[in-house]
Interface confidence: low
């Protein structure tokens, strides 16, 4: 997170830290006691699928305070439409091997109903993004969980206000832009997969997933997030289906 | 809200209760009627919570101890009669007034629903947690807010 602040301990209780072979991989969002939402691109280069760990209740990576809960990732489900190395359909659903225990420091973020997300949450201007990613483009990652308030843009406005870059990916209907184009604040590498959380009348909802951008906090560019509302039915159907064998599963979308 | 009290016994009311503090018994002497005394006393001792005219859209206000109740006209609902029940009450307009989820219905008014782990309150729009750790709430902030002293 570039230009953010420390999320006070316990105030981002749905934030997930994903580790592979003990090393920081990505962020994620707890949506109930056994399921985590993250970004598909986080898993492009994974070879040791059995060494994936999700940590809940984490705050400061340099110390263990007893509120952390670690769970093996039993399954990673990615939409069949996602192509590794690209940006569209950048979403993954992770099934934990065992449920986490909900505590003051471990709470799920609400996965909203699609219509509510599209016609109400999408028009809430500011939302929070969080993670332990880089504090500057090409800089060091954070030890404490960072958080940033970002404004959402309509895709048309995002395209009009962004500098044209020759090989820049399209902003599709499965994405949205949020943040600042003045180079001051953005999510960054290492925050990928983490939550874009929107507050409405006293409750927080998952509206986006940290996905991609032209560098981090680059002048003339916004951060791009996976538009979660497009995947609500896909996620719910998967969460209700019986577990399948194998760690990586490509599930048909839509 | 309590204009009728003024015409009851203006002289003694001014003398006993407005120029100086009066007790419930003294007020009872003035009004000679338990119900009217009670109505006067709620407003007199506690301040009239209806004084700020909180009930909107033609709703009438009844003062209570440290609170008030709005009686809404048929086309309105909500604590302050602020929500329209009529054709404007559809989900695309301010989420239909619902705290969480809203469903439109042909021929009848919209209905509000809540996420799992919450249930709908009697006002038909608000949601209350039914589990210890409902999604989307931050326990340490909820507890902090709950322990803050309330303004009078």
């Amino acid at each position: 997170i570039v230009g953010g602040k420390v999320c006070p301990k316990g105030e981002c209780p749905w934030q997930v830290l994903l580790l592979v072979n003990g090393a920081q991989l990505c962020g994620g969002t707890l949506i109930n006691t056994i399921w985590v939402v993250s970004a598909a691109h986080c898993f492009d280069k994974i070879k040791n699928w059995r060494n994936l760990i999700a940590v809940l209740g984490e705050h400061d990576l340099s110390e263990h305070d007893g509120d952390e809960q670690s769970r093996r990732v039993a399954q990673v489900i990615i939409p069949s439409t996602y192509v590794p190395g690209t940006t569209n359909h950048d979403i993954a659903l992770l099934r934990l091997h065992q449920p986490v225990v909900l505590t003051d420091h471990v709470v799920p973020l609400c996965l909203p109903e699609r219509t509510f997300s599209e016609r109400t949450l999408a028009f809430v201007r500011f939302s929070l993004v969080s993670g332990w990613g880089q504090l500057l483009d090409r800089g060091a990652t954070a030890l404490e969980l960072m958080v940033l308030n970002v404004p959402r843009l309509m895709t048309q406005d995002c395209l009009q206000q962004s500098r044209k870059v020759g090989d820049s990916p399209n902003i599709t209907e499965y994405m949205f832009c949020a943040g600042y184009s003045d180079g001051s604040k953005d999510s960054c590498k290492g925050d990928s997969g983490g939550p874009h959380a929107t507050h409405y009348r006293g409750t927080w909802y998952l509206t986006g997933i940290v996905s991609w951008g032209q560098g981090c906090a680059t002048v003339g560019h916004f951060g791009v997030y996976t538009r979660v509302s497009q995947y609500i039915e896909w996620l719910q159907k998967l969460m209700r289906s019986e577990p399948r064998p194998g760690v990586l599963l490509r599930a048909p979308f839509p | 809200a309590n204009a009728f009290l003024e015409e009851l016994r203006p002289g003694s009311l001014e003398r006993e209760c407005k120029e100086e503090q009066c007790s419930f018994e003294e007020a009872r002497e003035i009004f000679k009627d338990a119900e009217r005394t009670k109505l006067f006393w709620i407003s007199y001792s506690d301040g009239d919570q209806c004084a700020s005219s909180p009930c909107q859209n033609g709703g009438s206000c009844k003062d209570q101890l440290q609170s008030y109740i709005c009686f809404c006209l048929p086309a309105f609902e909500g604590r302050n009669c602020e929500t329209h029940k009529d054709d404007q009450l559809i989900c695309v307009n301010e989420n239909g007034g619902c705290e969480q989820y809203c469903s439109d219905h042909t021929g009848t008014k919209r209905s509000c629903r809540c996420h799992e782990g919450y249930s709908l309150l009697a006002d038909g729009v608000s949601c209350t947690p039914t589990v210890e750790y409902p999604c989307g709430k931050i326990p340490i902030l909820e507890k902090r807010n709950a322990s803050k002293p309330q303004g009078r």
């Epitope: 056994i34 449920p99 | 629903r113």
Partner: antibody, heavy 122, light 107 residues
Framework: QVQLQESGPGLVKPSQTLSLTCTVS?????????WSWIRQPPGKGLEWIGY???????NYNPSLKSRVTISVDTSKNQFSLKLSSVTAADTAVYYC???????????????WGQGTSVTVSS | EIVLTQSPATLSLSPGERATLSCRAS??????LHWYQQKPGQAPRLLIK???QPATGIPARFSGSGSGTDFTLTISSLEPEDFAVYYC?????????FGAGTKLELK
């Protein structure tokens, strides 16, 4: 094939504690399921008592919460129910059960024990 | 808590006929409703989960529909083994609650 088997005394005296055990076979109790107790008084409907995860987290019916304890013994692949201060109103068939899948708070009970009848009487 | 009201309490039909059982929730529960069948002396058996998804091994004559507060279990053509008590269950909010049941009896 998942199988659940309830065991415990069929007769309990009023004011005593009812204790039942559910032995699970064909499935590791330390997996991701929720393990429930549900009861059915004679000739009446079903009442959910509560459940436990391997992780140890529990959720009880508020109407029984003050009297109920559900615990798990992973080494024996068993989970147990204790219901204190019983009265004749606690006379019922007690079922142990496993949820088919788990999604937030919403799960359907796909596997049931055959039930054990408990009578509360002096 | 969410109260589920099942109707009718008793339904008398003959084999081959169509059975329609109703379950009404005291407040909206989206599609978090499950149906069970129970025969005398047996444990309940899951028929339908999440309003309309048949559980493993359930015959195609059983189907479920509805959303919000009104739900229906339909048995398209009754077989002799279908005569039993049917319960609906709320899976939306704790405590998990069951309806009082509908007894489907032979006419």
């Amino acid at each position: 094939q998942v199988q659940l088997q309830e065991s415990g005394p069929g007769l309990v005296k009023p004011s005593q504690t009812l204790s039942l055990t559910c032995t699970v076979s064909g499935y590791s109790i330390s997996s991701d399921s929720a393990w429930s107790w549900i009861r059915q008084p004679p000739g009446k409907g079903l009442e959910w008592i509560g459940y436990i995860y391997y992780s140890g987290s529990t959720n009880y019916n508020p109407s029984l919460k003050s009297r109920v304890t559900i615990s798990v013994d992973t080494s024996k692949n068993q989970f147990s129910l204790k219901l204190s201060s019983v009265t004749a109103a606690d006379t019922a068939v007690y079922y142990c059960a496993r949820s088919v899948n788990y999604y937030g708070n919403s799960f359907a009970v796909g596997y049931w024990g055959q039930g054990t009848s408990v009578t509360v009487s002096s | 808590e969410i109260v589920l009201t099942q109707s009718p309490a008793t339904l008398s039909l003959s084999p081959g006929e169509r059975a329609t059982l109703s379950c009404r929730a005291s407040q909206g529960i989206s599609d978090y409703l499950h149906w069970y069948q129970q025969k005398p002396g047996q444990a309940p058996r899951l028929l339908i989960k999440y309003t309309s998804q048949p559980a493993t091994g359930i015959p195609a004559r059983f189907s479920g529909s509805g959303s919000g507060t009104d739900f229906t279990l339909t048995i398209s053509s009754l077989e002799p083994e279908d005569f039993a008590v049917y319960y609906c269950q709320n899976g939306h909010s704790f405590p998990l609650t069951f309806g009082a049941g509908t007894k489907l009896e032979l006419k």
